[in-house]
Interface confidence: medium
């Protein structure tokens, strides 16, 4: 079959900026640690790099293969008001690489580390 | 309470990254249009603008305000593989601009849109 | 060009309310803090408020806190001082100042207005 | 709150001398430190920001130093319109605090 040269373009293109890389997405802080209910942050979400877009096949999941912290202050509110906001330095994890692994893998990288 | 202004505009700095907004995204093809899972897209992921980010209120949401629709060629792979991959042109919701609402009005919103 | 034009100050009465206003133009008014700083006749300058435009966050100074309240209308590109149970040590030019860029580290006022005097007296 | 003490509070100069004047705060300010300048009926006027940094179309005769606790504001060449009063400003911590001004003269 014969393709039209452009749509090729256009599809790699495509294939280009849905890999998986480190992409820059805002976190909920309150979630991504599960605090108390009555613990706010200000902002409540911080803005990371994580692991994201498409593996190839079914089987491949986009997972971090190295991780740097970054430290960000914030303000943290507990209700009822004891106090006014207090800045708090909080350390996230910062995906700097990543790769497709087999789903297989990440099961066992993941339990390999809970078993730690 | 005496704040150091480095830590202020620090976090003045992440709000505004995280706030609601458009943002590149990448989505899986088959899954946006739940297509028959014996058909595949080659690539299985596109690049478009969706709104993400986060609201200053646990009440609100980022929702999108205006919509553009971008045509992507992708190609399209049935099994059994009857003939070669075909390529398709296929529509895709692309967010122009996003608003953080109440979640009483997003409900609100889609029912209607569910109703007409 | 980058503009600051305050408005609202007069003569008024210990006790009494005054609202100032500081319309901006010529640049982004979400992405700069918008600051109030006092002086009083023939006196040094004193900063009395703050506000972030973009995420609303608020600072006072301890003279003033719980009696000026600082606010900002982005569809205007307005900021606002409401001064309430103002007394005779408040008589003072009010001048709005632009923070020189919020990727800056550190407060600095690149842009102030003109001024508007405020007397407190009987 | 963070003290900034101005010295001297006023000085007598000639066109064409060099001018320096200091700025001592109270505790560790790091470099958090501007320099404004403001003529009779006007605003102040920024020249230079972040203890070192001049200001843009500030001209180059201004220069700022220091760190920590003690700042210099120093006019290598004292021109006419420089005649005016000088303010340090801390912006460390809040509330950010101005020195009392220094007021140049002409001798």
């Known amino acids: 079959a014969h393709y039209n040269t452009e749509i090729l373009k256009s599809i790699d293109n495509e294939w280009r900026k849905t890999q998986c890389m480190p992409r820059e997405v805002s976190i909920d802080v309150g979630k991504e640690f599960g605090v108390a209910t009555n613990t706010f942050f200000k902002p409540p979400c911080v803005s990371v790099y994580r692991c994201g877009g498409c593996c190839n096949s079914e089987g491949l999941q986009c997972m971090n293969t190295s991780t740097s912290y970054l430290s960000k202050t914030l303000f943290e509110i507990t209700v009822p008001l004891s106090q006014g906001p207090k800045p708090v330095t909080i350390s996230f994890a910062n995906h700097t690489s990543c790769r497709c692994m087999s789903k297989l893998d990440v099961y066992r990288q993941v339990h390999s580390i809970i078993r730690r | 309470a005496h704040y150091n202004t480095e830590i202020l505009k620090s976090i003045d700095n992440e709000w505004r990254k995280t706030q609601c907004m458009p943002r590149e995204v990448s989505i899986d093809v088959g899954k946006e249009f739940g297509v028959a899972t014996n058909t595949f897209f080659k690539p299985p992921c596109v690049s478009v603008y969706r709104c993400g980010g986060c609201c200053n209120s646990e009440g609100l949401q980022c929702m999108n305000t205006s919509t553009s629709y971008l045509s992507k060629t992708l190609f399209e792979i049935t099994v059994p593989l009857s003939q070669g991959p075909k390529p398709v042109t296929i529509s895709f919701a692309n967010h122009t601009s996003c608003r953080c609402m109440s979640k009483l009005d997003v409900y609100r919103q889609v029912h209607s849109i569910i109703r007409r | 060009e980058v503009q600051l034009v305050e408005s609202g100050g007069g003569l008024v009465q210990p006790g009494g309310s005054l609202r100032l206003s500081c319309a901006a133009s010529g640049f982004t008014f979400t992405d700069n803090w918008i600051h109030w700083v006092r002086q009083a006749p023939g006196k040094g300058l004193e900063w009395v408020a703050v506000i972030s435009p973009y995420s609303g966050a608020t600072y006072y100074a301890d003279s003033v806190k719980g009696r000026f309240t600082i606010s900002a209308d982005t569809s205007k590109n307005t900021a606002y001082l409401q001064m309430n149970s103002l007394r005779a040590e408040d008589t003072a030019v009010y001048y709005c100042?632009?923070?020189?860029?919020?990727?800056?580290?550190?407060?600095?006022?690149?842009?102030w207005g003109q001024g508007t005097l405020v007397t407190v007296s009987s | 709150d963070i003290q900034m003490t101005q010295s001297p509070s006023s000085l007598s100069a000639s066109v064409g001398d060099r001018v320096t004047i200091t700025c001592r705060a109270s505790?560790?300010?790091?470099?958090?430190v501007a320099w404004y300048q403001q003529k009779p009926g006007k605003a102040p006027k920024l020249l230079i920001y972040s203890a070192s940094f001049l200001y843009s179309g500030v001209p180059s005769r201004f220069s700022g130093s220091g760190s920590g606790t003690d700042f210099t504001l120093t006019i290598s060449s004292l021109q006419p319109e420089d005649f005016a009063t000088y303010y340090c400003?801390?912006?460390?911590?809040?509330?950010?605090?101005f020195g009392q001004g220094t007021k140049v003269e002409i001798k």
């Open positions: 100042a632009r923070d020189a860029d919020y990727k800056y580290a550190f407060w600095a006022f690149d842009y």
């Open positions: 505790q560790d300010v790091s470099t958090a």
């Open positions: 400003q801390q912006s460390y911590t809040t509330p950010p605090t």
